[in-house]
Interface confidence: medium
């Protein structure tokens, strides 16, 4: 006769491991008992369980409640056992020793491999600001056994670097994604993808990029010079900029206080019916936590009675 087993049995942490051991004997042969032991190199054999044809299943105190026979129907020549709720410490070599009559004893070894699926974590890097050089956007760490694979899925252009740390029964892999921040990256997803044989599908963690910036400021409203004349109603100046975080706007007049009746509504400066006292230099001040910008315009309110053309100067400063 001969023993049938597997070279390697692979289970995921927490699953039940079936340790196979089947005696394929000749007619009339009987199995008296099957002894299972843990036989890691450098350590003595530690009994796991013993299946006896007459006395039944005996379980070592160290494995109490964790070793069972497979559910019926059972073949008397089958010495397989179930190791419940496999843990990392169960990984190693096991020996099945079968005592048969009249053929004698047979033994076989198998290796139990316990896969420990990773629980990945993603950590954003420091705040991203336009104008920085190559900067850490995020790092992703996953620990498992065997070592997981950590990659990145994104439309954003960048570079990756990985490092791994081996522990006694697992390995931790950390991958970093570096980029040169630009405003076009705002709102773009950066996804860490972790692959592992213990996972049914890849695990994905997505981080949305936020890049701080502030665009140059400009003022609209003075495009048609002929509209800025005494008596005109609904005249307004609008300050244009964009940024992350969204900027706040402030209006001032360079050559004095804002005239009475002029309304400030965020990025918009609204005028009452125009008079010559509305002429002057107006400054739009745009700021966020990242930066600040200024844009100034000269308003010259014309008297329609006069024939001279309106002069408008636009000056932008930052």
């Amino acid at each position: 006769g001969e023993l049938e087993t597997s070279d390697v049995v692979t289970v995921v942490l927490g699953q039940d491991a079936k340790l196979p051991c089947f005696y394929r004997g000749d007619s009339g042969e009987q199995v008296g008992q099957v002894a299972w032991a843990r036989v890691d190199a450098g350590e003595g054999a530690q009994e796991l369980a013993l299946l006896h044809s007459k006395y039944g299943l005996h379980v070592s105190p160290a494995y109490e409640g964790r070793v069972e026979q497979p559910p019926p129907p059972r073949n008397p020549l089958d010495g397989s056992v179930l190791l419940r709720n496999a843990v990392q410490a169960d990984e190693g070599e096991y020996e099945c020793r079968v005592s048969t009559f009249p053929a004698g004893s047979f033994q076989a070894r198998l290796r139990l491999r316990v896969l420990v699926p990773p629980l990945p974590s993603l950590n954003p890097g420091p705040a991203l600001e336009e104008g920085q050089g190559l900067t850490l956007a995020a790092s992703c760490t996953a620990e498992g056994s065997p070592a997981p694979s950590v990659t990145w899925d994104t439309e954003v252009k960048g570079t990756t670097s990985s490092r791994s740390f081996k522990h006694s029964r697992s390995a931790a892999v950390t991958s970093e994604f570096h980029l040169v921040p630009s405003r076009s990256m705002n709102g773009q997803p950066l996804t860490c993808v972790v692959s592992h044989p213990g996972l049914l599908q890849d695990q994905r963690i997505t981080h949305i990029l936020h890049v701080s910036f502030l665009a140059e400021a400009s003022v609209r409203g003075l495009e048609d010079q002929n509209l800025w004349h005494i008596g005109r109603e609904g005249a307004m100046l609008k300050c244009l900029s964009e940024g992350q975080p969204p900027p706040s706007y402030n209006w001032t007049r360079l050559d004095g206080p804002l005239p009475s009746g002029v309304r400030v509504d965020g990025d918009t400066l609204g005028f009452p019916p125009l008079t010559t006292e509305h002429s002057g230099i107006y400054v739009c001040h745009v700021s966020n936590e990242f930066s600040s910008r200024d844009s100034q315009v000269t308003v010259d309110v014309l008297d329609p009675q006069e024939d001279s053309g309106k002069q408008v100067d636009l000056v932008s400063a930052s």
């Epitope: 008296g32 008992q33 002894a35 032991a37 530690q46 009994e47 796991l48 369980a49 013993l50 006896h52 007459k54 006395y55 005996h58 379980v59 070592s60 105190p61 005592s99 009559f101 009249p102 004698g104």
Partner: nanobody, 118 residues
Framework: EVQLVESGGGLVQPGGSLRLSCAAS????????MGWYRQAPGKQREYVAT???????NYADSVRGRFTISRDNSENTVYLQMDSLRAEDTAVYYC????????????WGRGTQVTVSS
């Protein structure tokens, strides 16, 4: 040939405890399985518990959680700690040992009486 000698039996009240011992005349390392059976008056011999040379154990459902089998290979002795005894545990308790060679050889002791009564 292996001689098995039991001791520790006696009279005990319900809920009480007893500890049976069984000494073997040869090293228990070579004795593959040792254990206990019992026989009540007018009944068949009934399995109680067994222990392997490596310390793995098995129990009859009727005693699981109340009885504990242990083994001291250096003293060539097997023990049966019996707690929460009941009247139905009254029986002659026999030590058994099995030697595995080309076929299983089973040895028996003469037995020790356990009586549970108030």
């Amino acid at each position: 040939e292996v001689q098995l000698v039991e001791s520790g039996g006696g009279l005990v009240q319900p809920g009480g405890s007893l500890r049976l011992s069984c000494a073997a005349s040869r090293s228990t390392f070579s004795l593959n399985i040792m254990g206990w059976y019992r026989q009540a008056p007018g009944k068949q011999r009934e399995y109680v518990a067994t222990i392997t040379s490596g310390g793995s154990t098995n129990y009859a459902d009727s005693v699981r959680g109340r009885f504990t089998i242990s083994r001291d290979n250096s003293e060539n002795t097997v023990y049966l700690q019996m707690d929460s005894l009941r009247a139905e545990d009254t029986a002659v308790y026999y030590c058994t040992a099995e030697l595995v060679r080309r076929g299983p050889t089973t040895y028996w002791g003469r037995g020790t009486q356990v009586t549970v009564s108030s």
